[in-house]
Every structure is written in structure tokens, then in C-alpha cells.
């Protein structure tokens, strides 16, 4: 029979390659039975995970699963790093695996002088 424990389906060692300046939604797939748990996001800083208090989040409900979404509008270069979601369920803290965002800063890449510009200097 199906377990009624809360499950957080973030894949171990999962990675997302994203561009600075773009919007991005980081999803934490949450499976629960009756009452939706309280879910939060945090960002890893060494071995500690710093809670993301003032960030926009939302829920998306699907038939068999719900998603707790962390919004990046837009993605900034310092959003690079590893994130984890956690749920409070029946006074237990359930933690997901971490997922890593690799942010490419296209702006700084495009601002580098071209070969022609370098030659003319």
C-alpha cells in the first residue's frame, strides 16, 4: 500500500543550467495525503542551509503531486548554488536532496570586448 508520509521528489545530484536575466521556476515536487505540509526553500552555504525568507514562492497543484515553486524573476548571477526544500509534517522535518543551479552571466560575457575592439585599442 502507498505510504502516507510526505515525499519530496527532488532528484539527488540534479542540475539546472540557466541564464542570468531570465525568469526561472525551481520546483519542489511534494507528495502528501491529507493536509498539505508547510514547505520552505533554503540555499546551501557550506554545510548549513540558509532559509530563503523573502523570496516569492507559490504552489502548483497537479493530479497526483503538488509543486512548491521558488521564483527567480529574474535570475541573478549570485543565484548560482545548491538549494534544498524541506517540509514540516507531524512535527517531523523532511529534507529533500539538494539541486544545483549553474547560472551563466550572459551580460558580462557579452560585455567582454570583441577581438576587433581589442585590436583597435
Amino acid at each position: 500500500k502507498e505510504s502516507c508520509d510526505v515525499q519530496l521528489y527532488i532528484k539527488r545530484q540534479s542540475e539546472h543550467s540557466i541564464l542570468a536575466g531570465d525568469p526561472f521556476e525551481l520546483e519542489c515536487p511534494v507528495k502528501y495525503c491529507a493536509n498539505r505540509p508547510h514547505v520552505t526553500w533554503c540555499k546551501l552555504n557550506g554545510t548549513t542551509c540558509v532559509k530563503l525568507e523573502d523570496r516569492q514562492t507559490s504552489w502548483k497543484e497537479e493530479k497526483n503531486i503538488s509543486f512548491f515553486i521558488l521564483h527567480f524573476e529574474p535570475v541573478l548571477p549570485n543565484d548560482n548554488g545548491s538549494y534544498r526544500c524541506s517540509a514540516n509534517f507531524q512535527s517531523n522535518l523532511i529534507e529533500s536532496h539538494s539541486t544545483t543551479l549553474y547560472v551563466t552571466d550572459v551580460k558580462s560575457a557579452s560585455e567582454r570586448p570583441s577581438k576587433d575592439e581589442m585590436a583597435s585599442r
Epitope: 515525499q7 521528489y9 527532488i10 532528484k11 539527488r12 542540475e15 529534507e95
Partner: antibody, heavy 121, light 112 residues
Framework: EVQLQQSVAELVRPGASVKLSCTAS????????MHWVKQRPEQGLEWIGR????????KYDPKFQGKATITADTSSNTAYVQLSSLTSEDTAIYYC??????????????WGQGTTLTVSS | DVVMTQTPLTLSVTIGQPASISCKSS???????????LNWLLQRPGQSPKRLIY???KLDSGVPDRFTGSGSGTDFTLKISRVEAEDLGVYYC?????????FGGGTKLEIK
């Protein structure tokens, strides 16, 4: 109930390519990793690589880099491995395996029944 | 790559007797998240592999409690308290801590 459906057998000429498929039912592959594993006759298991169908990210064992290409189609809930420049060394059973991660860390939970690939002229 | 060495290669056991398989890894399988990603699989004759144990000692659903997994670091053991006829096949240890994932060479359990 989760099932992974693979074709039973393929016979291919040396030098040719082949694309093996693995269709999942009872589970959305976007929430999983899909792995491919090789087993040569009377031998052990070798991990070829895996795909994250949610974003197409792949990881390969370096010894299969250039030999195998793993793809996935989330609309048909199917993962594929394409094997190129086939030789007799590629004659084996190829298993797909579905890994999913919940908070209790499940992985390699389901295996297909395997496709027997024979490379022969 | 992490080398997984299983012993013995073949194990011949009388039904009702215990059995033990050893698996040693060439480096520690303790991950940075504090978990040890060591699994045991059973491949019955003519079938695909089926996972029995994950995270060293957690039994998959439907796996009888006569199976136990133990160990840490580089040394791991699968024990069957009383072997039954359905237990015959090839047992593999498999690690998913380090990239690439690697399997042991297998231990064939046969019934005496």
C-alpha cells in the same frame, strides 16, 4: 503499478547503429532518472549512463562516451539509448532502470526486462 | 572508478542454512550528505535484476526480513539468515556515491 516495457530482441549488422527504447507506465518519467545498464553474456552489470528527462541532462560512464547516446521523450514517457558503430563487443542484454527520489531516498526501484542485442553479420 | 570486490564468487548453501556475501569498495562510500549509497541486487536466473537493499541496510518493500545488509565505509555484508529455494541467483553490490556508478562482479548463490 510501475512497468518498464522494452523490446525483447534486436539483430543488427556490425558497423550499424541501433536505438533501443524503454517505455514507462504508472509513473511520469519527468520525476525520475532513467538509466541504461549493459550485461554481456554470462557477465556482470555495467552502468552506461542516465538521463534526467525533466531537462535532458545526461551523465555517462566515460567508457561509453561516444558509443551511447541517451535521450528521452516525456510526451510518450519513453527513454532511449542509441548505440553506434556496433561490434560483437556490443552484443549484450541492455536494461533500462528507473530511479526515483523521495525523502526516503529511493533509487533503481524498477528495471525493465531487458533487450537482447545481437551484433552479427 | 570505484572498484567493488565481492567474495565469494560462488556460494553453495543448504536450504535453511545461513549465507553471507562480502563487498569491499576501493574507497569510502560515505557521501558528503552523510548517507552511504550502497545497494544489493538479486538477479534470478533468466530475469532482470531486482533491488533488495538500499542505503546499506534498508530493505525494499516485499523483501523478506531474512535478508540483512550491514557495513560502513568500504566494507559491506549481505546476510541471509535461512536460505530458501527462491533465493538462488546472482547477488550484486552496487555503489552510487561516486561517479560513475559501479557494480560488484557478482556472487552466485546455488542450492546444495
Amino acid at each position: 503499478e510501475v512497468q518498464l516495457q522494452q523490446s525483447v530482441a534486436e539483430l543488427v549488422r556490425p558497423g550499424a547503429s541501433v536505438k533501443l527504447s524503454c517505455t514507462a507506465s504508472g509513473f511520469n518519467i519527468k520525476n525520475t532518472y532513467m538509466h541504461w545498464v549493459k550485461q554481456r553474456p554470462e557477465q556482470g552489470l555495467e552502468w552506461i549512463g542516465r538521463i534526467d528527462p525533466a531537462n535532458g541532462n545526461t551523465k555517462y560512464d566515460p567508457k561509453f562516451q561516444g558509443k551511447a547516446t541517451i535521450t528521452a521523450d516525456t510526451s510518450s514517457n519513453t527513454a532511449y539509448v542509441q548505440l553506434s558503430s556496433l561490434t560483437s563487443e556490443d552484443t549484450a542484454i541492455y536494461y533500462c532502470a528507473l530511479t526515483y527520489y523521495g525523502s526516503s531516498q529511493h533509487y533503481f526501484d524498477y528495471w525493465g526486462q531487458g533487450t537482447t542485442l545481437t551484433v552479427s553479420s | 572508478d570505484v572498484v567493488m570486490t565481492q567474495t565469494p564468487l560462488t556460494l553453495s548453501v543448504t536450504i535453511g542454512q545461513p549465507a553471507s556475501i562480502s563487498c569491499k569498495s576501493s574507497q569510502s562510500l560515505l557521501d558528503s550528505d552523510g548517507k552511504t549509497y550502497l545497494n544489493w541486487l538479486l538477479q534470478r536466473p533468466g530475469q532482470s535484476p531486482k533491488r533488495l537493499i538500499y542505503l546499506v541496510s534498508k530493505l525494499d518493500s516485499g523483501v523478506p526480513d531474512r535478508f540483512t545488509g550491514s557495513g560502513s565505509g568500504t566494507d559491506f555484508t549481505l546476510k541471509i539468515s535461512r536460505v530458501e529455494a527462491e533465493d538462488l541467483g546472482v547477488y550484486y553490490c552496487w555503489q552510487d556515491t561516486h561517479f560513475p556508478q559501479t557494480f560488484g562482479g557478482g556472487t552466485k548463490l546455488e542450492i546444495k
